[in-house]
């Protein structure tokens, strides 16, 4: 079964930027992911970053940068200032459209106990599951 | 099938503002940004901004900052382009495209004379 | 910004021979993470938007002729058309879809000799 995980840290340089990053665990090829915060797309989250493996990637403040880590994986860069800047308990989300296992988001936030710059191994997030 | 249709030609005066439409259909119109891109007579593409209609989220070309404001409505999936202290040298077709310039609106011709 | 420039800026090809076009980008279009190249080429005839011919600096857009391909890596990208048909007389464009702004080179118009 197709998994995504989602592991954010906030930096030990910035304590205000965070990194989120997020996976794909599963055979199929991805043809999107859209990563969020405040929620999943589309139900409250508003989305930062939109990225396809060939077309490119589009971002958007608070984004920084965006890119992709390897063909399943993604990362991306938030900025820490100003009024739209992340807080410790913000959520985020990644949602991956794969084919052909359909669309898998999962979300997640800075662990409570979290020292800047450390963060726990990336593991699987609760799953969320919209077929396309 | 997806389809951009934007607002008719405009005649506008030195100094005034400019309000391009950008109508979208067939596909999901806040999950992926509306692309702005001008082309002056006899020159090549250069990009404006974008905005996702899904958030109002914005990036601009540095050129046109203070001077461009794009807004779009989801109710009716349409995108907005409106440039300010317009200069004869904005005279130019204007496009909306979106999907990574997959798609385009067939261009808004925008002259600038007195 | 990242600066397109094209070569040549225009050609003449005989209809049934092939056409290739030189793009060169001022920084690598390469994402080494998924080594993806952020590449667009586009085709434009008069009085119509451009049209999206190839992206990922080698994939067809769907409905693109066969005889439409790119090729590069990096700074330095080709499109070729292997058998020029009347059709496709028009100005080519390469973008940069790498990094924001999106930039294009300055259009290759491509004629028939």
């Known amino acids: 079964t197709p998994e995504v995980w989602v592991q954010v840290r906030m930096e030990a340089t910035e304590l205000s930027s965070f990194t989120i990053r997020c996976g794909f665990l599963g055979s199929g090829s991805i043809s999107l992911v859209t990563v969020s915060w405040g929620g999943p797309n589309g139900a409250g989250g508003t989305t930062l970053a939109v990225l396809h493996p060939e077309r490119g990637i589009r971002q958007w403040a608070p984004a920084r940068q965006a890119r992709w880590e390897t063909q399943s994986s993604i990362s991306l860069i938030l900025e820490g200032s100003g009024a739209s800047s992340p807080c410790a308990n913000t959520t985020f989300c990644c949602k991956f459209a794969s084919f052909p296992e359909g669309s898998w988001e999962a979300c997640g936030s800075l662990p409570p106990s979290s020292d800047p710059g450390l963060s726990a191994p990336p593991t699987p997030a609760p799953i969320l599951r919209a077929d396309l | 099938e997806v389809q951009l249709v934007q607002s008719g030609a405009e005649v506008k005066k030195p100094g005034s503002s400019v309000k391009v439409s950008c109508k979208a259909s067939g596909y999901t119109f806040s999950s992926f940004s509306i692309e702005w891109v001008r082309q002056a007579p006899g020159q090549g593409l250069e990009w404006i901004g974008e905005?996702?209609?899904?958030?109002?989220?914005?990036n601009y070309n540095e050129k046109f900052k203070g001077r461009v404001t794009f807004t779009a409505d989801e109710s009716t999936s349409t995108a907005y382009m409106e440039l300010s202290s317009l200069r004869s040298e904005d005279t130019a077709v204007y496009y909306c495209?979106?999907?990574?310039?997959?798609?385009w609106g067939q261009g808004t011709l925008v002259t600038v004379s007195s | 910004d990242i600066v397109m420039t094209q070569s040549p800026d225009s050609l003449a090809v005989s209809l049934g021979e092939r056409a290739t076009i030189n793009c060169k980008s001022s920084q690598s279009l390469l994402n080494s993470g998924n080594q993806k190249n952020y590449l667009a080429w586009y085709q434009q005839k008069p009085g119509q938007p451009p049209k999206l011919l190839i992206y990922?600096?080698?994939t067809r857009e769907s409905g693109v002729p066969d005889r439409f391909s790119g090729s590069g890596s990096g700074t330095d990208f080709t499109l070729t058309i292997s058998s020029l048909q009347a059709e496709d007389v028009a100005v080519y464009y390469c973008?940069?879809?790498?990094?924001?702004?999106?930039?294009f080179g300055q259009g290759t118009k491509l004629e028939i000799k």
């Open positions: 905005i996702l209609p899904g958030s109002n989220s914005t």
């Open positions: 990922g600096a080698s």
């Open positions: 973008q940069n879809a790498h990094s924001y702004p999106p930039t």
């Open positions: 495209s979106s999907y990574w310039f997959a798609y």
